[in-house]
C-alpha cells in the first residue's frame, strides 16, 4: 500500500471527511477527472486539482497534527504528477504564487499576453500546424 | 493577423505594459515556457497560466474601456486552449472556482483524495487506458 | 424575444451560387458564435459551419469541399452563407441557429435558437 | 467520422416510458456536451436537453437526459408518453476539430 493512503486516511478523520454528509451534492474532482481521458487533457484538470490541494495544505501548514501527513502527500504528489522533477515542480510553484492583484504582475502578465496565446494551441509551431492539417482536414479557422 | 492581437496591444496600452521598466526582473511565464517542451508538462503550466489571466480579466470585467478586449481574449483562449469545447472550458472553470477556505469545499477535497492520487501518474489506470483507445482510433484531444 | 430571420433561398441551376442571410434581433449578436445547418427533405439534420464572435474564427463540414464561406457583420446583426458550385444534393432548408458566448462571460446555450429555415432547391 | 448512432424508430403507449440511445462511434462521450432536439413534422428543431441533462425552462421534467460512459453513448428518457411527443429527436454534440455532429434522429410514434 503506498504510503500516502495511511496519511490520507489521517487527514480525513482530522476534517471529519469520513463523514457519510460528505458525498452530498456531488464530487468536487472525480466527476471532472471520469470526463477525461487525453493526457493532455487530464493534465489541465489535474494542474487545477494540484494546486488547490497545495493551497489547502499551506493553510494547514503549522498544525503539528497533520504536519506529518501533508509532507508525506506532497512528496507522493511531487513523484507522481512532477516525476520527482523539482524544476517542474518550482516552475509550476512560481506560477501558482504570482498575486493578481498585484500591479507590476499584472503589467508583465499583459505584457507576454501575445506571445502567451501564440503557443497557447497545441499545434502552435508551423512545422506541426501542418502536418496536424493533413491528418484532420480540421477546422478552417482563420 | 489574430484578432487578439489588436486587442493585447489595446491591453498594453490601458496597462502601460508597453513600457522599458516592465521587463526587468526577468518573465512571469515565457521562461517557464520555454521550459518545457513535452505538451502534457507544457499543458500543467499553461492551466496554471491560464488561470492566471481569468483571474486577472474577471478583476477588470466591469471597466467598459477593456471590456471588447478582454472578451476578444477570452474567445480566443476559448478557441486555442480548450479547443472550443465548452465542457472542456465549463470543467475548467468549476475547479477555478473552488474555494480553499470553505470547510465543506476541504472535507470532500479530502475525502476524496486518495482516489485523485492514484490517479496522477500518467500510467494510473492501464486498462481504463486500453478501453479508452477503442473508442478512439486517433489521437484527438478531446 | 430572440428572433432569427433566415433569407435568400430559392431556386438554382446546378453549378451556381446564392448567398444566404440570417438577421439576428434580441440579442447582443456580437457576443454569440452562430451556425448553419440544414436538412434535405425527408432527411435527418446537418451541420454545416459555424463561426465564432469576436476572433472570426470558422468551422466547416468536410463534406462541403471548400464550396461554402460563412461571414456575418456584427454591426448589421447578421450572419451570411456564399454557397458556391451547387448541386442537387445540397436542396435542403438552411436553418441559422444560435450558439453560445464563447468567451464566457455570459455563456448561453448552444443551438437554444433557431430560424424558421430559408428553402434552397438545386435543380435544372 | 465521429457518428451519433441512433435507433431509426421507437414506438410505445401512451403513458408508457421511452428511452433513446445515442452512441458515440469514436472520441469518448463524455468529454463533449451532448444536446437533445424534437422535431415536429413540418417544424423547427426545438432543444429539450442541453449539456448532457440540463432542460430549459419551458420543458416538461417527463423529459430527461443521461450519460453513459461504460456504453460510450447518451440517452433521452421520456416518461408519462403523450401524443404531443410524438416528433424526430436528434442527439447532437461535437468532434475535436469543433465540428458539430448530429445524430441520424429517431421517429418517435405514440401508439
Known amino acids: 500500500q503506498d504510503p500516502y493512503v495511511k496519511e490520507a486516511e489521517n487527514l480525513k478523520k482530522y476534517f471529519n471527511a469520513g463523514d457519510p454528509d460528505v458525498a452530498d451534492n456531488g464530487t468536487l474532482f472525480l466527476d471532472i477527472l471520469r470526463n477525461w481521458k487525453e493526457e493532455s487533457d487530464r493534465k489541465i484538470m489535474q494542474s487545477q486539482i494540484v494546486s488547490f490541494y497545495f493551497k489547502l495544505f499551506k493553510n494547514f501548514k503549522d498544525d503539528q497534527r497533520i504536519q506529518k501527513s501533508v509532507e508525506t502527500i506532497k512528496e507522493d504528489i511531487n513523484v507522481k504528477f512532477f516525476n520527482s522533477n523539482k524544476k517542474k515542480r518550482d516552475d509550476f510553484e512560481k506560477l501558482t504564487n504570482y498575486s493578481v492583484t498585484d500591479s507590476n504582475v499584472q503589467r508583465k502578465a499583459v505584457h507576454e499576453l501575445i506571445q502567451v496565446m501564440a503557443e497557447l494551441s497545441p499545434a502552435a509551431k508551423i512545422g506541426k500546424r501542418k502536418r496536424s492539417q493533413m491528418f484532420r482536414g480540421r477546422r478552417a479557422s482563420q | 493577423q489574430d484578432p487578439y492581437v489588436k486587442e493585447a496591444e489595446n491591453l498594453k496600452k490601458y496597462f502601460n505594459a508597453g513600457d522599458p521598466d516592465v521587463a526587468d526582473n526577468g518573465t512571469l511565464f515565457l521562461d517557464i515556457l520555454r521550459n518545457w517542451k513535452e505538451e502534457s508538462d507544457r499543458k500543467i503550466m499553461q492551466s496554471q497560466i491560464v488561470s492566471f489571466y481569468f483571474k486577472l480579466f474577471k478583476n477588470f470585467k466591469d471597466d467598459q474601456r477593456i471590456q471588447k478586449s478582454v472578451e476578444t481574449i477570452k474567445e480566443d483562449i476559448n478557441v486555442k486552449f480548450f479547443n472550443s469545447n465548452k465542457k472542456k472550458r465549463d470543467d475548467f472553470e468549476k475547479l477555478t472556482n473552488y474555494s480553499v477556505t470553505d470547510s465543506n469545499v476541504q472535507r470532500k477535497a479530502v475525502h476524496e483524495l486518495i482516489q485523485v492520487m492514484a490517479e496522477l501518474s500518467p500510467a494510473a489506470k492501464i486498462g481504463k487506458r486500453k478501453r479508452s483507445q477503442m473508442f478512439r482510433g486517433r489521437r484527438a484531444s478531446q | 424575444e430572440v428572433q432569427l430571420v433566415e433569407s435568400g433561398g430559392g431556386l438554382v441551376k446546378p453549378g451556381g451560387s446564392l448567398r444566404l442571410s440570417c438577421a439576428a434581433s434580441?440579442?447582443?449578436?456580437?457576443?454569440?458564435?452562430m451556425h448553419w445547418v440544414r436538412q434535405a427533405p425527408g432527411k435527418g439534420l446537418e451541420w454545416v459551419s459555424s463561426?465564432?464572435?469576436?476572433?472570426?474564427?470558422?468551422y466547416y463540414a468536410d463534406s462541403l469541399k471548400g464550396r461554402f464561406l460563412i461571414s456575418r457583420d456584427n454591426d448589421r446583426d447578421s450572419l451570411y452563407l456564399e454557397m458556391n458550385s451547387l448541386g442537387v444534393e445540397d436542396t435542403a432548408i438552411y436553418f441559422c441557429?444560435?450558439?453560445?458566448?464563447?468567451?464566457?462571460?455570459?455563456?448561453?446555450?448552444?443551438?437554444?435558437?433557431w430560424g424558421q429555415g430559408t428553402l434552397v432547391t438545386v435543380s435544372s | 467520422n465521429f457518428m451519433l448512432t441512433q435507433p431509426h424508430s421507437v414506438s410505445e403507449s401512451p403513458g408508457k416510458t421511452i428511452t433513446i440511445s445515442c452512441t458515440r462511434g469514436?472520441?469518448?462521450?463524455?468529454?463533449?456536451?451532448v444536446q437533445w432536439y424534437q422535431q415536429r413534422p413540418g417544424g423547427v428543431p426545438k432543444i429539450v436537453v442541453f449539456?448532457?441533462?440540463?432542460?430549459p425552462s419551458g420543458v416538461p421534467d417527463r423529459i430527461s437526459g443521461s450519460i453513459d460512459t461504460s456504453t460510450n453513448s447518451a440517452s433521452l428518457t421520456i416518461s408519462g408518453l403523450q401524443t404531443e411527443d410524438e416528433a424526430d429527436y436528434y442527439c447532437?454534440?461535437?468532434?475535436?476539430?469543433?465540428?458539430?455532429?448530429f445524430g441520424g434522429g429517431t421517429k418517435l410514434t405514440v401508439l
Open positions: 469514436r472520441g469518448y462521450i463524455a468529454s463533449y456536451y
Open positions: 434580441g440579442f447582443p449578436f456580437s457576443r454569440y458564435s
Open positions: 447532437q454534440s461535437y468532434d475535436d476539430a469543433n465540428h458539430v455532429i
Open positions: 441557429a444560435r450558439g453560445y458566448d464563447t468567451s464566457g462571460s455570459d455563456s448561453g446555450v448552444d443551438f437554444q435558437y
Open positions: 463561426m465564432t464572435s469576436r476572433t472570426n474564427h470558422k
Open positions: 449539456e448532457d441533462t440540463q432542460r
